[in-house]
């Protein structure tokens, strides 16, 4: 037989076994010009020493073969002995290692069989009523196709599906969408209405994420507040990566899960912007404020479930950093300025009350005064910190107040509001004899003592009503008792107590009269 012709003799090898896992697959035959035809196929398994034979049976019942050698593509003309206008059956037999393997057959009319391309270029993927919709441009001059898809998950083999007939410049397919696993899809096409025409090759993989992005499983830790008033949020556990099917491993556009970090600064509610969304890879610095943090996972179908955490405020206080002066016009706070043109947020809330009751005020950008201080003033009429109770004050600063991650904590401290000198006056002062020349003075703790760091000291004053001599005794803010000694029997004394803050002298308590009785000996 001549090599260019189909040889009408028995093939030069024994019968075939089509049952093995290896062997020829995916035979495609089509017309490539007015008088030339091509068949191509895949071969799975070791290729060393394999000889391929393209087999053909005609409608007349006669059969022939082309010897292709080690090639997996063969061209022939309409003069090769194969009838191109009538139905023929073609298949491949591959002879290797003393056995023959056989491909599935194709039965077709060669003249009408056109080489169809799989979907080429961009395959758009969208979600439609709980299903997957794929859409692509029909390859040039190939309108009218039958389309199939195959799909697999990381744990399942290929499953075949049908897209139905297509007859337009764009083609589409509805496919199953998995809730929780990624899928790999491939598409192939063949000529519509041409009996037994060959399928195209499979398209490049289309990688599709699950409908629900995986819930992020991450953990955070927050570093200590630094000298600059900022603390770093660090990721302790990376989110788990989505398992991908074989053809989607490596570069798999379409299956990406993006994790975003949503920050919500709970403190200082009067600032312009309370939330900011960042990429999870870019871990921010935070002020000492309280935050809610959410990690949101999303894929091309939208966001999934999120995971949220609360980051409590840093409650480390700076008892000396804040000066407060109370005048007739109102109250002014002073603190060490951070830099030029800083916006400050002053937040206060009554101690022991819910964080939601915090009040705040935003200053205009300000430069340090000649003493290097920043200030905030308010009048008595404003009602700010006007009640006689303990307030927790935090001051935040930012050169860019519109950027949530650029705020820093300047200081946190306590302040007693209203008329602190009067409100702090100790009550229930009592005097008890202690010895022949001394007494013990006790009093109820000042209201100022409920405010950490505010009460600097108690002062106890003792006045000799005869000589008008006055002595004052400082007492630690944690003590509510003092012993006065060196007193004389029979003399009238008055005792008073006051509570002082770092910036304010307290108001004396009501005078308490006492005397030590003269001891008469028998």
């Amino acid at each position: 037989c001549r090599t260019s012709e189909c040889c009408f003799q028995d093939p030069p090898y024994p019968d075939a076994d089509s049952g093995s896992a290896s062997g020829p697959r995916d035979l495609r035959c089509y017309r490539i010009s007015s008088d030339r035809y091509e068949c191509s196929w895949q071969y799975e398994g070791p290729t060393a020493g394999v000889s391929h034979f393209l087999r053909c049976c005609l409608s007349s019942g006669r059969c022939c073969y082309f010897a292709a050698g080690s090639a997996t593509r063969l061209q022939f003309s309409d003069q090769a002995g194969v009838s191109v206008l009538y139905t023929v059956t073609l298949w491949v037999e591959s002879w290797a290692r003393n056995q023959t393997e056989k491909s599935p057959e194709v039965t077709l009319q060669l003249y009408n069989s056109v080489k169809y391309e799989p979907p080429l270029g961009d395959i758009k993927v969208s979600k439609l009523a709980g299903q997957l919709r794929m859409e692509w441009e029909t390859p040039d001059n190939q309108v009218g196709a039958e389309v199939q898809f195959r799909h697999r998950t990381p744990s399942s083999p290929w499953k075949l599906g049908d897209c139905g007939p297509q007859d337009d410049d764009t083609e589409s397919c509805l496919c199953p969408l998995e809730m929780n696993v990624a899928q790999e899809f491939q598409l192939r096409r063949r000529q519509l209405g041409s009996q037994g025409s060959s399928w195209s090759k499979w398209s490049s993989p289309v990688c599709v994420p699950p409908e629900n992005p995986p819930q992020p499983q991450v953990r955070f830790s927050v570093e200590q507040l630094g000298q600059d008033g900022r603390r770093r949020l660090t990721l302790k556990e990376q989110p788990t990566q989505l398992e991908l099917p074989e053809g989607c491993q490596g570069l798999a556009p379409g299956t990406e899960v993006t994790y975003r970090l949503q920050l919500h600064m709970l403190s200082c509610p009067c600032k312009a912007k309370a939330t900011r969304t960042l990429h999870l890879g870019k871990m921010p610095y935070l002020s000492g404020a309280a935050y809610n943090v959410a990690v949101i996972s999303s894929n091309q179908f939208g966001p999934g479930l999120n995971q949220t955490w609360h980051i409590p405020a840093d409650t480390h206080t700076e008892p000396v950093a804040l000066n407060i002066s109370v005048g007739t016009n109102g109250t002014t706070m002073y603190w060490p300025a951070r830099a030029q043109s800083m916006t400050y947020c002053i937040e206060w809330q009554p101690v022991g009350q819910d964080g939601g009751l915090a009040t705040c005020s935003l200053t205009a950008p300000q430069d340090p005064d000649p003493a290097g201080m920043a200030t905030y003033s308010w009048s008595r009429e404003s009602g700010a910190m006007g009640q006689e109770k303990c307030y927790y004050i935090t001051i935040f600063a930012s050169a860019h107040p519109e950027k949530l991650t650029l705020w820093s904590t300047v200081l946190s401290t306590y302040h007693f509001g209203g008329n602190a000198s009067a409100a702090g006056t100790p009550h229930h002062v009592s005097v008890k004899n202690h010895s022949l020349d001394s007494v013990s003075v006790d009093w109820a703790p000042s209201l100022l003592s409920t405010c950490p760091g505010v009460l600097k000291e108690y002062v106890v004053r003792c006045r000799d009503e005869d000589s008008k001599q006055v002595s004052e005794h400082p007492v630690q803010p944690t003590e509510t008792q003092v012993t006065l000694s060196g007193l004389r029997a029979g003399v009238a004394y008055t005792v008073q107590v006051r509570a002082d803050t770092a910036w304010l002298r307290g108001v004396w308590s009501q005078p308490q009269r006492f005397s030590i009785e003269v001891q008469v000996s028998d």
Epitope: D15, S18, T89, E105
Partner: nanobody, 123 residues
């Protein structure tokens, strides 16, 4: 060598159904095309249906199209012919045949043959 054994024939009333089986001895059977033929006394053997080794291609004589279905189970080395809406004209001995080639029409030279099974359709 492939040995074929037909079974499932019998007597059935017109309009009834039968299912014929063709079992093969050889493992290599899964790479063979299989056809059913029938013959009545004094007449030539007539092609009924054929199926390729993959099961992807089938072919039917015009007289049985829409009534008969050919299928195969390669795991069991068996080919089936499901015959529905039987007519008295379907009465014949049914033979199964196998060949390494698949013929796209009713014509073809089959290498291996079974002994046949009788199907009788009464009116």
């Amino acid at each position: 060598q492939v040995q074929l054994v037909e079974s499932g024939g019998g007597l059935v009333q017109a309009g009834g159904s039968l299912r014929l089986s063709c079992a093969a001895s050889a493992r290599i059977f899964n790479s063979y095309a299989v056809a059913w033929f029938r013959q009545t006394p004094g007449k030539e053997r007539e092609f009924v249906a054929s199926i390729s080794w993959s099961g992807g291609s089938t072919n039917y004589a015009d007289s049985v199209k829409g009534r008969f279905t050919i299928s195969r189970d390669n795991a069991k080395n068996t080919v089936f012919l499901q015959m529905n809406s039987l007519k008295p004209a379907d009465t014949a001995v049914y033979y199964c045949a196998a060949d390494r080639n698949y013929y796209p029409s009713v014509l073809g030279k089959y290498t291996y043959w079974g002994q046949g099974t009788q199907v009788t359709v009464s009116s």
